[in-house]
């Protein structure tokens, strides 16, 4: 059966929970959620010195 694509993670990290294509994997909490609950980091403006803040739920890319 075809499931959503799984992403590769670090060697020591547990395998991600597989999600049906209707959902996305939230890396921080390690479970599947509606994709709209995930926020991708905004691109950093030119010349900015600090990275964009990360939100509670980050998608696994």
């Amino acid at each position: 059966m075809r499931r959503g694509p799984r992403s590769l993670r670090g060697r020591d990290a547990p395998a991600p929970t597989p999600c049906v294509p209707a959902e996305c994997f939230a890396l921080l909490v390690r479970h599947c959620v509606a994709c709209g609950l995930l926020r991708t980091p905004r691109p950093k403006p030119a010349g900015a010195s600090s990275p964009a803040p990360r939100t509670a739920l980050q998608p696994q890319e």
Partner: antibody
Framework: EVKLVESGGGLVQPGGSLRLSCAIS????????MSWVRQPPGKALEWLGF??????????EYNPSVKGRFTISRDNSQSIFYLQMNTLRAEDSATYYC?????????WGQGTTVTVSA | DIVMSQSPSSLAVSVGEKVTMSCKSS????????????LAWYQQKPGQSPKLLIY???TRESGVPDRFTGSGSGTDFTLTISSVKAEDLAVYYC?????????FGGGTKLEIK
């Protein structure tokens, strides 16, 4: 072939409870999310919630409109999926459908009718 | 909750005509990481349960005739039937699954002249 068959509908008094069942065949039950959707007579569809698959610990999501009154569960050994409905109101009268979730709500049962009336 | 608005609420067409129906969401359904729009279209024929036609706004479900086409992105979506057949008599619903609770539009009823 995927087959979903709902049962358990009927007439119930306001304040009463009812448990709907969805019998599943044609696919591995533990590997899919299962959802409930309802449709009042002549009206649009309303998503009630779903239960995730084994890999996701059978966790649930609910529509806030029914959260606390409705509970979704599953008996994987019998390939049955349930909707427990408590404190029923007249506005809960509808045809209730179970659906398999993959890309969206991919496959639907034929529905079972619930009427809440004194 | 995301509000889904469909228009028109009903339309009557002759067999062979092209039909377009609209679905608008109160917020974007586009997930930027994968460029998918989390929108589906369903067909509900009289006395039957809904059937999935289109998912991710434009991907046709297996077995769905190619006269059905979904398009759009963000908040504005369209379902087009290129040449209507008598068997297309139904109510068509759009639904977002971008976030919880999943929500449906009010439907567009397609009648055949």
């Amino acid at each position: 072939e995927v087959k979903l068959v709902e049962s358990g509908g009927g007439l119930v008094q306001p304040g009463g409870s009812l448990r709907l069942s969805c019998a599943i065949s044609g696919f591995t039950v533990t590997a899919y999310y299962m959802s409930w959707v309802r449709q009042p007579p002549g009206k649009a569809l309303e998503w009630l919630g779903f239960i995730r698959d084994k890999a996701n610990g059978y966790t649930t999501e609910y529509n806030p409109s029914v959260k606390g009154r409705f509970t979704i569960s599953r008996d994987n050994s019998q390939s049955i999926f349930y909707l427990q409905m408590n404190t029923l109101r007249a506005e809960d009268s509808a045809t209730y459908y179970c659906a398999q979730v993959r890309r969206a709500l991919d496959y639907w049962g034929q529905g079972t009718t619930v009427t809440v009336s004194a | 909750d995301i509000v889904m608005s469909q228009s028109p609420s009903s339309l009557a067409v002759s067999v062979g005509e092209k039909v377009t129906m609209s679905c608008k969401s109160s917020q974007s359904l586009l997930y930027s990481s994968n460029q998918n729009n989390y929108l589906a279209w369903y067909q509900q024929k009289p006395g039957q349960s809904p059937k999935l036609l289109i998912y991710w706004a434009s991907t046709r479900e297996s077995g769905v005739p190619d006269r059905f086409t979904g398009s759009g992105s963000g908040t504005d979506f369209t379902l087009t039937i290129s040449s209507v057949k008598a068997e297309d008599l139904a109510v068509y619903y759009c639904q977002q699954y971008y976030t919880y609770p999943y929500t449906f539009g009010g439907g567009t009823k397609l009648e055949i002249k």
